[in-house]
Structure formats: C-alpha cells, structure tokens
C-alpha cells in the first residue's frame, strides 16, 4: 500500500575530520520508495563536480572536502561552522524533511587563558596550579604532565577541576616541572612549564613572621639605557631596599608603582611587578617625563608583608621619538595652512609643549621656522607669490624638538588659481617628487 515518506534516521551533528570524507546519514520509509535530496543551509546541493558532495544509493551523503564557506558574522563561525545539512525524502504522496545537522571543523587556538606559574609549596599543605586552556571546538580537555610524563592522578590527593590541578597534600616528590596540555580533535597545545618547589614546614607561622618584616626602600635610580635595546628604549630604574625583622626572609618582593597625580587629586591605581632580587632589582617599562611613586612589598606564598615607604622619582623628559603624523598643506587666501596630528602617545616622552615648523630652502619661502605653542596642531603662513612651499614639523617637549616629519610640499600655480598637492592620488608631494616635476 502506498504511503508518504517518513524520516527514520536523521542526520547528526558532526565534526569534519579529514583526510577521509564526512558521512551524513538519512534513511526514510515510504511507498513508492522516496528519493533523497540534500540541502546545505536551505540550498539544494548540485552533486555535480566540482561540488565536493556525493550521494550514495542508500541516501548517505559523502563530503569529500570541506565546502567553500559563505560569509559569517564573525571569525569564529567562519573558522568552525561548515553549515547545516538537511535531507528531504519525496515520493508522489509528499515530502518529509529531516532535522538539521550541523557540520563543523575542529579548531584549537594557541593562546592559553591562564598559564601555570612557578610556585613554592610546603610539605603537607594544599597547593593549586592554575590552567585555562585555549579556545577550541570541540571544547578541549586538560591533562597535566610532570617532568615530561603524564601525571598519574592519585584519587584523594590530585583533583583536576576547571583545568586547574589541586594537590591536597604536598609531598617532597611533587617537586618538579609541570605542564598543562589542552587536547581536542584538532590537536593539542602545551602550556609553559611551571617549576614547583616543595619546602619542609617551618616552626614559625609564615604570615605572622611576614607581618614583622620591615622594608626600607632606600634608593630609586634611573638606569642608563642599554645601547643593545636600540636608540629609543623605555626607561628603567634600579630599586634598592633593606629588610629587617625576623630571620626568615620573604620568598619574593613586588614593586608597586604609579604615576603621581596633581596634589589633592585621586591617586592612580598601583601597578605591580614581581622583582627578580632580594635587596635590589631592576624595574622597567616606565615612561619618560612622568613623576612616579615607588614602594616594595614582601610576600611568601600567598601571604603578604607590609609595604615599604614610598619614594618619588621624576623621570626626565626626552625629545619625542616619532614625528607628528598626517602633515598636510592646504592653500588659503594668500596663505597656506599647515596641519598635523600629534605623534603617537607612546612616543611623546614627556609633555608636548608645542611644535616647531620649518620651511625648507630652495623653494618660494626662504628658510624659516615657526614655533606653535600648546596643543594647537595647525599654522597659517602668509604667501606672496606662486611656487613651491615645503615644510617639516616636529613635536617639542621640555627636552627640545623631536624627530621631524618628512618634508611635505604644495605647488601654488600662477595667480594661485589652482593648488596641487597630490600627484596622481599618492598623497602629499615629497621634496623628491616636487624636484622631479619642476625639472620636467
């Protein structure tokens, strides 16, 4: 007896894992036996080469290679989602449509959210190594390796939760190098190696001892730049401190530093940097032309001692290490307008107090320079005759004028009817382009 089609086996969501083909199953009942056709994102598949899909007699769809992907809202969908497949079974009595099945590609990105850190634990006490794996599809699993071998998890002593390794009771044998490994069908990624040291318990209680530690920050000195770091390195300082109090020293010292705000203003938040030293250490990554406050804090494990006194240091201004950007020349009525954008903030090296503008010789302007004070980023120059006008601009801090911009030129033609600044749509004229044009 004739009957309309019914889907018996629906296609299932799956990952495309080359090199072999992906298979999407679809089985249907009905009399006469229904014909199967497949749709991708609602569009029928042609099955004609170069279409990578192939239909088997039993209705199974073979996907020989990932189909070309259309536009997606975001890179994540574009990198993982191959689309939704549905099958249709039809005979003269009707058509049945299956559930949609999503085909996706396995992905495992490289950046860990949290990397395990070196640490010191005490025998008999609990410690945790944190790990946040990279984004992956499907979601990666995390395993832990110790000294280059998979860690044998002991129930009751080891727990892996949300990527982190919890050790209930530290033993001397737990000392070693730990690594977190994220794995999914796309492959695996290894975290940095974290060194775990295990100490014997002390007779004293750490936090109480730390509270008795006194740190005297004695000196903050500006270091001479290392020539190996290039011509314009960021400033670094050398911190020196003295520790007094109990015999047991702190395990580590942290520098706290911030830029000083105007008197009465709310202080900036303190930035923290672990120091590689016990009585003195270098602290880098500062900015020229800023007033800084510094202090040092002792710590041992999770316990923190009291902060040291605060010392102030004014880092001198340097000349700006980049020129003003987007320098343009525009004709006015008997004038030319010069305008520019300040150098990037990271190149200010202090407070920009103004700008120096030079006109270049051998042009219609005699060699001259102008000083623009304050935050103004434009200048009007009087012009008395047609010809070429070329300028350079440099930002000025308390240390002087910085790197000048490339020369930018403007060609004012007879009677100033027309001004040319852009040879064939390539931006402002350079001095070289202008000379070539004048020669022609």
């Amino acid at each position: 007896q004739d009957s309309p089609p019914q889907i018996l086996v629906h296609p299932q969501d799956q990952l495309f894992q080359g090199p072999g083909p992906a298979r999407m199953s679809c089985q249907a009942s009905g009399q006469p036996p229904p014909t199967i056709r497949w749709l991708l994102n609602g569009q029928p598949l042609s099955m004609v080469p170069p279409d990578p899909h192939h239909l088997l007699p039993d209705g199974t769809l073979l996907l020989l290679q990932p189909p070309a992907r259309g536009h997606a809202h975001d890179g994540q969908a574009l990198s993982t989602d191959l689309g939704v497949y549905t099958c249709e079974a039809s005979n003269r009595l009707g058509t049945a449509v299956s559930r949609g099945a999503r085909l996706s590609v396995a992905v495992l990105r490289e950046d860990f959210q949290i990397q395990p850190r070196d640490m010191v634990a005490v025998v008999g006490e609990q410690f945790t190594l944190e790990c946040g794996p990279p984004w992956g599809h499907p979601e990666p699993t995390v395993s832990w390796w110790k000294d280059g071998k998979p860690l044998a998890l002991q129930p009751g002593r080891h727990t892996v939760s949300g990527g982190s390794l919890l050790m209930a009771r530290a033993e001397k044998s737990d000392e070693g190098t730990y690594m977190c490994v994220a794995t999914n069908s796309a492959g695996h990624r290894e975290s940095r190696a974290a060194r775990v040291s295990i100490q014997e318990p002390q007779d004293y209680t750490e936090p109480v001892e730390l509270l008795a530690v006194r740190i005297q920050l004695e000196n903050v000195t500006l270091l001479n730049p290392d020539p190996a770091e290039g011509p314009k390195p960021r400033p670094a300082v050398w911190l020196s401190w003295k520790v007094s109090g109990p015999a047991a020293p702190a395990q580590s010292y942290t520098a706290l530093f911030r830029t000083q705000t105007a008197p009465g203003g709310q202080g900036a938040p303190w930035a923290e940097e672990l120091l590689a030293g016990w009585q003195s250490a270098e602290l880098g990554g500062l900015h020229w032309g800023q007033d800084y406050e510094f202090k040092v804090r002792p710590s041992s494990g999770r316990a923190r001692g009291p902060d040291s006194n605060v010392l102030l240091l004014r880092l001198p201004e340097k000349v700006p290490s980049a020129p003003p950007q987007e320098v343009t020349l525009k004709p006015g009525n008997g004038t030319v307008f010069v305008s520019w954008v300040p150098p990037p903030a990271e190149n200010h090296n202090g407070i920009i107090r103004g700008y120096q503008v030079w006109s270049l010789g051998n042009t219609s302007l005699p060699p001259a320079n102008w000083t623009v004070v304050g935050e103004q980023t434009q200048l009007e120059i009087a012009t008395h005759m047609p010809g070429s006008y070329c300028v350079q601009v440099a930002a000025v801090t308390g240390a002087g004028a910085g790197e000048p911009s490339r020369p930018v030129c403007l060609l004012l033609e007879q009677a100033m009817e027309r001004a040319t600044q852009e040879p064939s749509e390539h931006g402002p004229w350079t001095l070289e382009q202008l000379r070539a044009t004048l020669k022609r």
Partner: antibody, heavy 118, light 112 residues
C-alpha cells in the same frame, strides 16, 4: 540576528543572593564562550566572569571569586550568574556578552540592574 | 593585575575634526605567542557598549572606517579621523590578554 536579553535583576539586601539569566538567540549558543560585565551607576565597566562554550572552564576577578558563579544551559540557550553574599559595591547594571574565541566581546545585552541596599 | 589607564579622560571635540584617545597598560599586552588582545568599545548615552576595534587594529563589521586602532606592547591609540555627532559617548579600552581582564577608566567624548 544575535540577541541577548538579561533578566533577574532587582533590589536585594546586603548578604543576600540573586540569580541573573541571559537568554540568547540568533546564533549557535553552544559554540560560544560567554561573559558577564557590570557597570556601577555613573562608573566604568568591570569584567565579572567568563565561561567556556561547554561550561567546563570559568574565570573570575578576585573581587567576585568565591561569591559569584557563572554557568550555562546549552539546551535552553541560557547563561546564568548566581550571586551570593552580595555587597553594596555589587550594585550595578549587569550585561551579558558573547565572546569570539576568547578574543573580544562582540554583542552585548541591554543589561539588568542589581541594587544591593538595606 | 594589569592596570589600564586612558588619556584624556574627557575630550571635547569639533565636528569634522580628528580625535585621538590613548590607552596604556601597566604590563605588556603581547603574550608569549606574539598576540595582543586589546579591544576598543563605545558606550553611547543610555546604551550598552558596542565593539569598535578588536585585537588592536581590526575594525568590527559595520564600524565606519573613520575609526582606526594602533599600538603595541603597553601603548595603544584609537583615532577618529573626522568626528561625527553620533560618535559622542564614553570610549573604553579592554585587555583580554591576561586574566583578570581589565577595562580602562573610559574617555568621555562630547561636542564642543
């Protein structure tokens, strides 16, 4: 069209609890990590929690760690934030947002206001 | 934790003129793989934040090309080549290189 709709905000006493929900539609919820971000009245934005697409991995700042729990139900396309031991400084508009990988928050809900006051 | 600072905190601008906002981090935002996760958001008055720039310099879909991002390490800049009336609001930078993720304090942009 991607849509995120937060609910569950309201007035709660210090020390109390509240559970926020975020209903997601217009995208395959189960393949995206999600986050909560809050904004105290007249203040800036503060990241509160992130959860991986399968719910295995969660991340919090110290200010809420141990008090707030982010979770998700992929079958219901819903993100949750369970907030316990609430304090006056938790008063804020809470936004849920979709994450692309763990790189950036691309779509945000309209927010739900949580007021902690006696 | 990484501290993000922005300058200026308030920026009165003239329509049609350029504008620039700086964002600095207390540590480098470049991770061990050489990737930098610094994003810019605009929160218009009474609205939720909206993404402008991701991973330092990539414009999000639908964001006008007058917005551009640049920078590396600890120093980043958002530029608007010609400010329009719809650009007013508070601009935030956000770093997601290191957990906990941290926002800058915001820069309020309004028309002079």
């Amino acid at each position: 069209e991607v849509q995120l709709v937060e609910s569950g905000g309201g007035l709660v006493q210090p020390g109390g609890s509240l559970r926020l929900s975020c209903a997601a539609s217009g995208f395959t919820f189960s393949t995206y990590a999600m986050s909560w971000v809050r904004q105290a009245p007249g203040k800036g934005l503060e990241w509160v929690a992130t959860i991986s697409q399968g719910g295995t991995y969660t991340y919090y700042p110290d200010s809420v760690k141990g008090r707030f729990t982010i979770s998700r139900d992929n079958a219901k396309n819903t993100l949750y934030l369970q907030m316990n031991s609430l304090r006056a400084e938790d008063t804020a508009v809470y936004y849920c947002a979709r994450l692309i990988y763990y790189d950036y928050l691309d779509y945000w809900g309209q927010g739900t206001l949580v007021t902690v006051s006696s | 934790d990484i501290v993000m600072t922005q300058s200026p905190l308030s920026l009165p601008v003239t329509l049609g003129e350029p504008a620039s906002i700086s964002c600095r981090s207390s540590q480098s935002l470049e991770n061990s793989n050489g990737n930098t996760y610094l994003n810019w958001y605009l929160q218009k008055p009474g609205q939720s934040p909206q993404l402008l720039i991701y991973r330092v310099s990539n414009r999000f879909s639908g964001v006008p090309d007058r917005f551009s991002g640049s920078g590396s390490g600890t120093d980043f800049t958002l530029k608007i080549s010609r400010v329009e009336a719809e650009d007013v609001g508070v601009y935030y930078c956000l770093q997601v290189t290191h957990v906990p993720w941290t926002f800058g304090p915001g820069t309020k942009v309004d028309i002079k």
